[in-house]
């Protein structure tokens, strides 16, 4: 059986997540993935997606959230900069596949945020905004809206995350146009 | 639990090929990316190979690369490595790892099988 | 490729005081690392990764910091079982991955 397994992140305030979502090079390449996050009690809620088709490599910046499609290697990054207390909670990787339901990928990231000074460039105790660098051709891509009613039971993203600072210079805001999609066993 | 468990080494002349095998169980194989790390002796780790869960995407350290080709069978739970034209310096302990659920560092490791290559 | 150095080859301490072992990559890594330890005739083991995060069943007197090129492992009291060899390894979005040379810590 396949077992829902989670991956812990602890990070502090104004660091940043970054995780690799591993997906089957053949099937998946140009599909369209998001990155959502799972709150108790509540339908998994899409926070940003890719292009449709997905584009190679293509930044797709949605507010403090950055997705990066890598074809060749099989691989979504994901990055959430400037992380808040807020921002604590369980996240996955699904790729959309209509008319069928998304496929969700393997581990969920649990995400810790505590306040606190991180130590990472760019950040410190009394900034409240932050300035990080991202790839200066970003793109905001719309996420489809499934109205299925139907909970999640299937297994987990696989991820393949670790902790960085971005590469190149931009402004980042609060996550914006969040949408509600639940995902389906 | 997870348990990862390696077969295949022993001596074979420089040249040579040898097949590395690693039975995993007590996690979802399929799912998660698998690696061959490798130590000669008195010396430190060396990546060697990583195929991801699908076996859809393969990557090599290019002291190998052409040489020797990963490989896994997710219906039986099992990777291999298969070693072909063996040089002295591949002599090593080689473990088979699993890859993190979240990045490409080794959460879990076998106990390592010895190969050694000498004339 | 990214040039994982460590640093000391060898510390020396004694049962119950710190140990400082630090890590250096040649090019930013950002917080892409981790730390193994390996007793004689044993497989590597995972500390840390993250650069911070303790993995599962990793007592709290190992600690990772550092994030770009420096980066510190910690083990705040030294018991007699954490005398061993310890590696750092970064893992930035592509390979190869690359592991340090190692540090020895030995009892003084």
């Known amino acids: 059986a396949t077992k829902l397994t989670e991956e812990k992140y602890e990070l502090k305030e104004g660091q940043t997540l970054d995780v690799k979502c591993d997906y089957t090079l053949e099937k998946f390449a140009s599909s369209q993935k998001a990155w959502q996050i799972i709150r108790d009690g509540e339908m998994p809620k899409t926070l940003a997606c890719t292009e449709r088709p997905s584009k190679n490599s293509h930044p797709v910046q949605v507010g403090r959230i950055i997705l990066e499609d890598y074809h060749d290697h099989g691989l979504l990054r994901v990055r959430m900069v400037n992380l808040q207390v807020e921002d604590s909670g369980l996240y996955q990787c699904v790729i959309y596949q209509p008319p069928k339901e998304p496929h969700m990928l393997f581990d969920r990231i649990r995400l810790v945020v505590t306040k606190g000074f991180s130590g990472t460039p760019g950040s410190n105790e009394n900034s409240t905004q932050n300035v990080y660098k991202i790839p200066p051709t970003t793109t905001k891509a719309l996420c489809p809206l499934y109205t299925s009613p139907r909970t999640v039971t299937q297994a987990p993203p696989k991820s393949t995350a670790d902790v960085s600072t971005p590469d190149s210079e931009i402004n980042l805001t609060n996550v914006t146009d969040i949408i509600r999609v639940p995902v389906f066993n | 639990e997870v348990q990862l468990l390696e077969s295949g080494g022993g001596l074979v002349q420089p040249g040579g090929s040898l097949r590395l095998s690693c039975a995993a169980s007590?996690?979802?194989?399929?799912?998660?990316?698998m690696s061959w790390v490798r130590q000669a002796p008195g010396k430190g780790l060396e990546w060697v190979s990583t195929?991801?869960?699908?076996?859809?995407?393969?990557y090599y350290a290019d002291s190998v690369k052409g040489r020797f080709t990963i490989s896994r069978d997710n219906s039986k739970n099992t990777l291999d490595l298969q070693m072909n034209s063996l040089r002295a310096e591949d002599t090593a302990v080689y473990y088979c790892?699993?890859?993190?659920?979240?990045?490409?560092?080794?959460?879990?490791w076998g106990q390592g099988t010895l190969v050694t290559v000498s004339s | 490729e990214i040039v994982m150095t460590q640093s000391p080859a060898t510390l020396s301490v004694s049962p119950g005081e710190r140990a400082t072992l630090s890590c250096r990559a040649s090019?930013?890594?950002?917080?892409?690392l981790a730390w193994y330890q390996q007793k004689p005739g044993q497989a590597p083991r995972l500390l840390i990764y993250?650069?911070?995060t303790r993995a599962t069943g990793i007592p709290d007197r190992f600690s990772g910091s550092g994030s770009g090129t420096e980066f510190t492992l910690t083990i705040s009291s030294l018991q007699s079982e954490d005398f061993a060899v310890y590696y750092c390894?970064?893992?930035?979005?592509?390979?190869?991955?690359?592991f340090g040379q190692g540090t020895k810590v030995e009892i003084k």
């Open positions: 007590g996690f979802t194989f399929n799912a998660y990316a």
């Open positions: 993250g650069a911070y």
């Open positions: 195929i991801s869960g699908s076996g859809s995407t393969t």
């Open positions: 090019q930013s890594i950002n917080a892409n």
């Open positions: 390894q970064e893992f930035i979005l592509f390979p190869p991955w690359t």
């Open positions: 790892a699993k890859v993190a659920g979240s990045n490409f560092f080794f959460d879990h």
